[in-house]
Interface confidence: medium
């Protein structure tokens, strides 16, 4: 579990980009939004996240989505489908 | 197998820039997000930074910002490392190094042969 | 910048001996820890990944441990052609890093 911390002036992140990887795990807590995150899912793919960076990101996506996530996530998952466990997939409600 | 080819050396003035190449083979090339690294004599290793060879995503450390520049030619399966106002201190091996198949893993799993890169006038 | 620290740059061994290189990072690094083997004038060799994982082909007497800040390379019944430099590597985050590395010599 990541702390909750305030987001360090001038690292609130505008967009979900390649400069993210250089975040410390509780950066990306504090500075990602969650909606910004799930709005930008296709981008994750294309930025070489480490797996306890992944764990952040698939964290704030469980705090915006606690009753599963909506299609529009799903199907932009890409690795991050890679932290998703059982219980998490049978939230999903997929047409 | 899986391959990566570099140029066994180059003598470079100081102030100059070189570009140095690695020649994948043996696998997708487009596939596999490309690393490069330094090393120095006696002084361990160096990430320098990654490029993803098919969408072109570049990250570098922030000690080789202003240093180097990575770029890959799709065509012919090739990395290339910019690196720029050559001093003695870039004087160094530089290898290219493919990360593990798996993403996250970000350790190196294919080494390119290792380009000596000597900076003198 | 996470630092990896291998605190012996030479060890001394024995043919057949066991010998246990280590390798300390700055801070928790969970288990994503490499290993590597490097002869002279050429390029690294992975040895070990995720701490403890061997990589494929190489021998069952290499083997890894450690997690979070501390990490060991074990060589069972080392062999003369093991007498070489070994590096780990930290990518639990962004720059990666490695330790300078650990030369084992002959006794």
């Known amino acids: 579990e990541v702390e909750k911390t305030a987001c360090p002036s001038g690292k609130k992140a505008p967009e979900i980009d390649e400069s993210l990887i250089f975040y410390k795990k509780w950066e990306l807590e504090a500075c990602v939004d969650a909606a910004l995150l799930a709005t930008q899912m296709d981008r994750v793919n294309a930025i070489p996240f480490t797996y306890e960076q992944l764990d952040v990101l698939k964290h704030k996506l469980d705090e915006l989505y606690p009753q599963g996530y909506p299609e529009s996530v799903i199907q932009h998952l890409g690795y991050l489908f890679l932290k998703m466990s059982p219980e998490d997939i049978r939230k999903w409600n997929v047409t | 197998q899986v391959q990566l080819q570099q140029p066994g050396a180059e003598l470079i003035k100081p102030g100059a820039s070189v570009k140095l190449s690695c020649k994948a083979s043996?696998?997708?090339?487009?596939?596999?997000?490309m690393h490069w690294v330094k090393q120095r004599p006696g002084q361990g290793l160096e990430w320098i930074g990654i490029?993803?060879?098919?969408?072109?995503?570049?990250n570098y450390n922030e000690r080789f910002k202003s240093k180097a520049t990575l770029t890959v030619d799709k065509s012919s399966s090739t990395a290339y490392m910019q690196l720029s106002s050559l001093t003695s201190e870039d004087s160094a091996v530089y290898y290219c190094?493919?990360?593990?198949?798996?993403?996250?893993?970000?350790?190196?799993?294919?080494w390119g042969t290792g380009t000596t890169v000597t900076v003198s006038s | 910048d996470i630092v990896m620290t291998q605190s012996h740059r030479f060890m001394s061994t024995s043919v057949g001996d066991r010998v246990s290189i280590t390798c300390k990072a700055s801070?928790?690094?969970?288990?994503?820890v490499a290993w590597y083997q490097q002869k002279p004038g050429q390029s690294p060799k992975l040895l070990i990944y995720?701490?403890?994982t061997q990589h494929t082909g190489v021998p069952d007497r290499f083997t890894g441990s450690g997690s979070g800040t501390d990490f060991t390379l074990t060589i069972n019944n080392v062999q003369s052609e093991d007498l070489l430099d070994y590096f780990c590597?930290?990518?639990?985050?962004?720059?990666?890093?490695f330790g300078a590395g650990t030369k084992l010599e002959l006794k």
């Open positions: 190094a493919r990360r593990s198949s798996n993403y996250g893993d970000w350790y190196f799993d294919v």
């Open positions: 043996g696998y997708t090339f487009t596939s596999y997000w």
């Open positions: 801070q928790d690094v969970g288990t994503s």
């Open positions: 490029i993803h060879p098919n969408i072109g995503s570049t």
């Open positions: 995720w701490a403890s």
């Open positions: 590597q930290q990518y639990s985050s962004y720059p990666l890093t």
